[in-house]
């Protein structure tokens, strides 16, 4: 039992090695730079992050290609709820530092949560994804 | 007032068998986790089992695990714990608790526990 | 010997404020929410945290819970003497699909 769970750390390890969640990254950026235009942004604070939007992406044509490639790479991890909820952590973890605010912060959160639905895929159970940045040791 | 009443304790010697129950009343018994927990006399607290909702995913302590067996029966609300081949490690109080953990992004946590059954292996 | 570290006792003056750590790994208070249980004499445990940070209807704010990477606090301000009693983390862990307790800790009001 044992054995089988440390064989399947390792292949959880090396499909998280192999993926390529950054799709998933710039379409939750997307979309929530998405919303914030919709309810208006604040002038004062102009968004800096890397993956701000072009007027194509902010028509929605480009995040949703995003969306079906980071739907694609989620569906790697379908059949391993733990492993799922680890790629959600790091993408979590990777864009916690770009996230401006708190409320960014909440939105990017709510709508990470809704990610796997929204891929037809299951949501993991037993995850927590109020990650800090860099405080978490690895499996 | 949600209530948890176990029953089933007694003094069986090692290798014998036992069944105990839980009659849950002040909630919709169905639509929650329910979960078995011991205390070994002057120790800290050990998770022995959890039923998921419809019975249909169970999970045990690895010391327990083909020994006991955990149930549950929504039409009654009613949960069980089904002890076999038993030995002194474990004797303790028996707790049945409804565990709060939800579909998604959730975590296993024991908002109501009944006062507890004493089950003791002793020859 | 339980796989999440408790210093097994904590002790503080009336009024004052403690913090009981629980201390774990990544496979379990790592990737998933910590809950708190208080065991006064004699009575079975009672839930004072879940989700982390969340506190049941009943428990006063005097009670708290944080989590950081792979440890977790509990805080208790305005000690009571009514608050001596056994106090236990409990997370899932991932690699052994069991839920862990922590091996308790005994707060004494002095």
């Known amino acids: 039992r044992q054995q089988w769970e440390l064989q399947g750390d390792r292949r959880c390890q090396s499909q998280l090695e192999r993926a390529n969640l950054r799709p998933c990254e710039q379409h939750l950026m997307q979309k929530i730079q998405r919303d914030e235009d919709s309810y208006g942004r604040d002038p004062y604070s102009p968004s800096q992050d890397p993956y701000s939007p072009s007027p194509y992406d902010r028509r929605g044509a480009g995040s949703s290609q995003h969306q079906e490639r980071c739907c694609n790479e989620l569906n790697e991890f379908e059949n391993n709820q733990r492993c799922m909820c680890e790629a959600l952590q790091q993408i979590m973890e990777n864009q916690s530092d770009r996230l401006q605010g708190r409320q960014q912060e909440q939105q990017f959160k709510r709508e990470l949560r809704n990610l796997p639905q929204q891929c037809g895929l299951r949501a993991p159970q037993r995850c927590d994804l109020e990650v800090e940045s860099g405080g978490r040791d690895r499996y | 007032e949600v209530q948890l009443v176990e029953s089933g304790g007694a003094l069986v010697q090692p290798g014998g068998s036992l069944r105990l129950s839980c009659a849950a009343s002040?909630?919709?018994?169905?639509?929650?986790?329910m979960t078995w927990i011991r205390q070994a006399p002057g120790k800290g607290l050990e998770w022995v089992a959890n039923?998921?909702?419809?019975?249909?995913?169970?999970d045990y302590l690895d010391s327990v695990r083909g020994r006991f067996n955990i149930s549950r029966d929504n039409a009654k609300s009613v949960l069980y714990l089904q002890m076999n081949t038993l030995s002194a490690d474990d004797t303790g109080v028996y707790y049945c608790?409804?565990?709060?953990?939800?579909?998604?992004?959730?975590?296993?946590?024991?908002?109501?526990w009944g006062q507890g059954i004493l089950v003791t292996v002793s020859s | 010997q339980s796989v999440l570290t408790q210093p097994p006792s904590v002790s503080a003056a009336p009024g004052q404020k403690v913090t009981i750590s629980c201390s774990g790994t990544g496979s379990n208070i790592g990737h998933n929410y910590v809950s708190w249980y208080q065991q006064l004499p004699g009575t079975a445990p009672k839930l004072l945290i879940y989700?982390?940070?969340k506190r049941p209807s009943g428990i006063p704010d005097r009670f708290s819970g944080s989590k950081s990477g792979t440890s977790a606090t509990l805080g208790i301000t305005g000690l009571q003497t009514g608050d001596e009693a056994d106090y236990y983390c409990a997370t899932w862990d991932a690699d052994l699909s069991a839920v862990l307790f922590g091996g308790g800790t005994k707060l004494t009001v002095l």
């Open positions: 002040g909630f919709k018994f169905s639509t929650f986790y």
């Open positions: 608790t409804r565990n709060g953990l939800q579909d998604s992004y959730s975590g296993d946590f024991f908002d109501h």
């Open positions: 039923i998921k909702q419809d019975g249909s995913e169970k």
């Open positions: 989700d982390n940070t």
